[in-house]
C-alpha cells in the first residue's frame, strides 16, 4: 500500500470542504479496487468534524471510509466556527489505511483553516463584515457586530497582542453620508480609524438624507504595531455596505413555512407554502431573499437562470413558480438559512426545510414471529418489522391491512390496527393467540415512511414447549421405547394443568410409531399410532419401530418425526424429532431403551438375554405421576369468540386462580 496526495487540506472558516484525490490518494501494487482501500479514523478532527455527504450529517462521527468515497467527493470536513476570533488554525486527522493482506499504513491529514484563503462563500477576510442598515436621514453606530477585524489581531502572539491594533484606512468614502470617529468626521486628510475605536463604539455613520439609495465605503485593514508602527502581517481590502431604509416602511412579516418534500435526484418547485411574506407596501419583486447557508442535499435554481445554483431571488420568482429545488443524490434532510428583506428594512432570517423522500421503501422481515407455546403471546421486534429505504427509517408507521386469523395485535393490552416503529422497538406491540386451533398465523401490514408506503406479511409460528433428545444413532430394525427421555412435554403439562396431546403429522420415512402391549399377558401385537399423549409417554406405552432404508446398501441414515403438540389454553405447535439410524450393533450401548432388536441379531446371538423382551418395557424413565397438578402458578388464558363473540372475548385475559389439585393415576 502507498499513500500519495498532499495530505493537506485548506478550509475556509466555517465551511465544508470535500477531501479529494489531490489530498488523499491511496493505491496498492495489486491495483486494488478503491472500494477495498479502507481508511479508519484513529483520531478525529478537533476543530470540526468529518462526515459522509450521503449520510445523516448530524449523527455519529465518521469512523470508516473508502478511497472510492474520497474520489466521489463524499467525505467532507466541516470547520466549526469557534467563539474566539483567529486568523489561522491547524487541525489534524490520524488515519489508518488498510487493504488486507497488505500491511496497514498510518497517515496524518493536516487541515489548515485560514482567513487568508480565497473563499467564495465567505468573501470577507475579516471576522465580521456584515454591513449596516440605517434609517433615511439618521445615524447609526457601526459596532463589532457589523465590522470586526479581531482575527487580524489574533495572528499576533497573545503576549504582544495588547500592544497591537488594526488600522482601517478608508480608500473610498461614503457618497450619501459621513463617517465619524468620536464625533469627528473622517476625510481625505484623516482617513483612518482603529479596531479599538470600533470596539469602543466610537464609529458612526450619519446619513445625509435625500433618498434611500445604497451607500458604503471601501477600506484597507492591516496590523499596526506599538506606537503606530506598520508591521508585517495579514491585511485585506474590502467594502462595507450601508443600506438606507425608508423611515415610514413597515417591515415584511414572514409566514409559516411548510417543508419541501421531494425524492432523491428530483426537482420540485418552491411555492408560497414554503416561502412567503406579508408586506402591504412592497411588491413581490421588491422582496429579496439571499441564501446564507445551503444544505448538502441540493441547490436552488431559477427557470431560465442557467443550470447552476442561485443565491439571490425574489418573492416574484417564488410566486411565478420559477424557483425550484434540485435534489442531488443525498438522502439527508437539510435546511436553507435565508435572509429576507424588502430593501428598506433590516434583513430577517428565514429558513426553508427540505425533506428528501425515499423513492421506495422496503419492509425487512428477517424472521417470523416466534410465540412461546406456554405464553401464547410475543412482542414484535426489528427482526419482524423494520423499514429501510436508502437508510433505516426509525419513524415508520404501520397499519394493519389484513388482521391475523387466530389472534390479535395488542398495544398496551388493547387490540390495535395501527402502531409505530418506535412502539415495536420498545417491545410494546404484542401478538397474542386468542384462538387455539392453529400453530401458525399471519397478518399483513402497510408501512408508511416519509410519504412512501410498502406492504409486507408477518408470519407467526408457535415454538413448542417440548424437550426433544434423540441421543446417538438408533439401531435399524429395532423397536425402541418412546418415553420422556426422548420426548417430554411435562413442562407444558405443568404450565397448562392439562395432559398435552401429540399428533403425528409426518414420518418416520423408514419405520412407524406403535402402541406396545403393557405385558406379555396383554393380547395383540403392537398397533400403529397417529395420536398419543404425554401420559402415554410417561406410561412407556409407545414404541418406534426403526426401519431400514430400502434400495440401498446398509449404513447410517437420517429420519425424523414431525408432531403437532397441543394442550389446554395455549396454541398448538409443530415440532420435529430428528434422529440418525445405523445398522444394529450388539456391542454398542444405545442411549434409548430397546423393546426389541432385529430378528437377525437375535438369531446370531442365539441367547434370549441378548435383547430386551418385547412385551415388558424396562424401568420407567420418569415418575409415574401424571403430567398435571404439579404447580400453583396463575394461568393467563386468551379466548376469542368464534361466532359473533369477538367483541365480547376480544383478547381478554382470564386469570385462573387455583392451586392445582393432585390427581391420582389410573391404569
Amino acid at each position: 500500500l502507498s499513500l500519495k496526495g498532499s495530505q493537506t487540506l485548506t478550509v475556509c472558516p466555517g465551511s465544508v470542504q470535500p477531501l479529494s484525490s489531490q489530498t488523499l490518494r491511496a493505491s496498492s501494487s495489486a491495483g486494488t479496487d478503491p472500494q477495498l482501500l479502507l481508511y479508519r479514523v484513529v483520531r478525529g478532527p478537533q476543530l470540526g468534524r468529518l462526515f459522509h455527504a450521503q449520510q445523516d450529517s448530524t449523527g455519529e462521527a465518521l469512523v470508516n471510509f473508502t478511497q472510492a468515497e474520497v474520489y466521489a467527493g463524499n467525505i467532507l470536513y466541516e470547520h466549526e466556527m469557534p467563539p474566539e476570533p483567529f486568523w489561522e488554525a491547524h487541525d489534524t486527522l490520524e488515519l489508518q489505511l488498510s487493504s488486507p493482506p497488505a500491511r496497514d499504513v498510518a497517515a496524518t491529514l493536516a487541515v489548515a483553516v485560514s482567513f487568508e484563503a480565497a473563499c467564495p462563500q465567505h468573501p470577507s477576510h475579516l471576522w465580521k463584515n456584515k454591513g449596516l442598515w440605517v434609517p433615511e436621514g439618521q445615524r447609526a453606530r457601526i459596532t463589532v457586530a457589523a465590522l470586526d477585524a479581531s482575527n487580524l489581531l489574533a495572528s499576533v502572539p497573545s503576549p504582544q497582542r495588547s500592544e497591537h491594533d488594526v488600522l482601517f484606512q478608508v480608500t473610498q468614502f461614503p457618497s450619501r453620508g459621513q463617517l465619524l470617529v468620536s464625533e469627528e468626521p473622517l476625510h481625505a486628510g484623516q482617513p483612518h480609524f482603529l479596531q479599538s475605536q470600533l470596539a469602543a463604539g466610537q464609529l458612526v455613520y450619519a446619513h445625509g438624507g435625500g433618498g434611500t439609495q445604497q451607500d458604503g465605503f471601501h477600506f484597507r485593514a492591516h496590523l499596526q504595531g506599538p506606537a503606530g508602527a506598520s508591521v508585517a502581517g495579514p491585511q485585506t481590502s474590502e467594502a462595507f455596505a450601508i443600506t438606507v431604509r425608508d423611515v415610514n416602511e413597515r417591515p415584511p412579516q414572514p409566514q409559516a413555512s411548510v417543508p419541501l418534500r421531494l425524492t432523491r435526484g428530483s426537482r420540485a418547485p418552491i411555492s408560497r407554502a414554503q416561502l412567503s411574506v406579508v408586506d402591504p407596501d412592497s411588491a413581490p419583486g421588491e422582496i429579496e431573499y439571499e441564501v446564507q447557508r445551503a444544505p448538502h442535499n441540493g441547490f436552488l435554481s431559477l427557470v431560465g437562470g442557467g443550470l447552476g445554483p442561485v443565491t439571490r431571488f425574489t418573492q416574484a420568482d417564488v410566486d411565478s413558480g420559477r424557483l425550484a429545488f434540485v435534489a442531488n443524490g443525498s438522502s439527508v434532510a437539510g435546511i436553507f438559512q435565508l435572509s429576507m428583506s424588502d430593501g428598506a428594512s433590516p434583513p430577517l432570517p428565514m429558513s426553508l426545510a427540505v425533506d428528501i423522500l425515499p423513492s421506495a421503501i422496503e419492509v425487512q422481515l428477517r424472521a417470523p414471529l416466534e410465540v412461546p407455546q406456554a405464553l401464547g403471546r410475543s412482542s414484535l421486534s426489528q427482526q419482524q418489522l423494520r423499514v429501510v429505504s436508502d437508510r433505516e427509517e426509525p419513524e415508520a408507521a404501520y397499519r394493519l391491512i389484513q388482521g391475523p386469523q387466530y389472534g390479535h395485535l395488542l398495544v398496551g393490552g388493547r387490540p390495535t390496527s395501527a402502531f409505530s416503529q418506535f412502539q415495536i422497538d420498545q417491545g410494546e406491540v404484542v401478538f397474542a393467540f386468542t384462538n387455539f386451533s392453529s400453530s401458525h398465523d399471519h397478518f399483513r401490514v402497510l408501512a408508511l415512511a416519509r410519504g412512501v408506503n410498502a406492504s409486507a406479511v408477518v408470519n407467526v409460528t408457535v415454538r413448542a414447549l417440548l424437550h426433544v433428545w434423540a441421543g446417538g444413532p438408533w439401531p435399524q430394525g429395532a423397536t425402541l421405547r418412546l418415553d420422556p427421555t426422548v420426548l417430554d412435554a411435562g413442562e407444558l403439562a405443568n404450565r397448562t394443568g392439562s395432559v398435552p396431546r401429540f399428533r403425528l403429522l409426518e414420518g418416520p420415512r423408514h419405520g412407524r410409531v406403535v402402541r406396545v402391549p403393557r405385558a406379555r399377558t396383554e393380547p395383540g401385537g403392537s398397533q400403529l399410532v397417529e395420536q398419543f399423549t404425554q401420559q402415554d409417554l410417561e406410561d412407556g406405552r409407545l414404541g418406534l419401530e426403526v426401519g431400514r432404508p430400502e434400495g440401498r446398501a446398509p449404513g447410517p441414515a437420517g429420519d425424523s418425526l414431525t408432531l403437532e403438540l397441543w394442550a389446554q389454553g395455549v396454541p398448538p405447535a409443530v415440532a420435529s424429532l430428528d434422529f440418525a439410524t445405523e445398522p444394529y450393533n450388539a456391542a454398542r450401548p444405545y442411549s434409548v431403551a430397546l423393546l426389541s432388536v432385529p430378528e437377525a441379531a437375535r438369531t446370531e446371538a442365539g441367547k434370549p438375554e441378548s435383547s430386551t423382551p418385547t412385551g415388558e418395557p424396562g424401568p420407567m424413565a420418569s415418575s409415574p405421576e401424571p403430567a398435571v397438578a404439579k404447580g400453583g402458578v396463575d394461568e393467563q388464558l386468551y379466548f376469542q369468540g368464534g361466532s359473533g363473540l369477538n367483541d365480547i372475548f376480544e383478547a381478554q385475559k382470564i386469570e385462573w386462580h387455583e392451586a392445582r389439585a393432585h390427581h391420582h393415576h389410573h391404569h
Epitope: 384462538n435 387455539f436 386451533s437 392453529s438 394443568g497 392439562s498 395432559v499 396431546r501 399428533r503 395420536q531 399423549t533 401420559q535 403437532e564 397441543w566 394442550a567 389446554q568 389454553g569 398448538p572 401424571p626 398435571v628 397438578a629 379466548f639 376469542q640 368464534g642 390427581h663
Partner: nanobody, 116 residues
Framework: EVQLVESGGGLVQPGGSLRLSCAAS????????IGWVRRAPGKGTELVAS????????RYADSVKGRFTISCDTSKNTAYLQMNSLRAEDTAVYYC?????????WGQGTTVTVSS
C-alpha cells in the same frame, strides 16, 4: 355447521341448582379440553371450570370450588356443568368452549340468573 350449543340456563333462587349442557356437533369431544366460561354484566370474563375429556382431569376457579362439577359424556358427545348452592354472584352468561386438534369453538351462551 353449529359446533357447540349450550342449554339448561334459567332463573333459579339462591341455594338452588342447575345443570348446563354443551352439545357438540361435527366433531368428537372425546379428545378435547372443554371449558365453561362466564361473563357477568359489567365484569370481566372468568374461566370457571375445565376438563380433559380423555383423562377426566378437572380444574375449578376458587369461587366455584366444591359447588360446581364439570363432566364429559363422550357417548352423547356432550359436556355438563352441574351447579349447586347457587349464589347471586353466579348470575352471568355461561359459554362453553372446546379446544382440540386444530379446533377451538365457542357456543352462543346460556343465561343463568340467581335471584330471590
Amino acid at each position: 355447521e353449529v359446533q357447540l350449543v349450550e342449554s339448561g340456563g334459567g332463573l333459579v333462587q339462591p341455594g338452588g341448582s342447575l345443570r348446563l349442557s354443551c352439545a357438540a356437533s361435527s366433531f368428537n369431544i372425546k379428545d378435547t379440553y372443554i371449558g365453561w366460561v362466564r361473563r357477568a354484566p359489567g365484569k370481566g370474563t372468568e374461566l370457571v371450570a375445565s376438563i380433559d375429556c380423555i383423562y377426566g382431569y378437572t380444574r375449578y376457579a376458587d369461587s366455584v370450588k366444591g359447588r360446581f362439577t364439570i363432566s364429559c359424556d363422550t357417548s352423547k358427545n356432550t359436556a355438563y356443568l352441574q351447579m349447586n348452592s347457587l349464589r347471586a354472584e353466579d348470575t352471568a352468561v355461561y359459554y362453553c368452549a372446546a379446544q382440540g386438534y386444530r379446533l377451538h369453538y365457542w357456543g352462543q351462551g346460556t343465561t343463568v340468573t340467581v335471584s330471590s
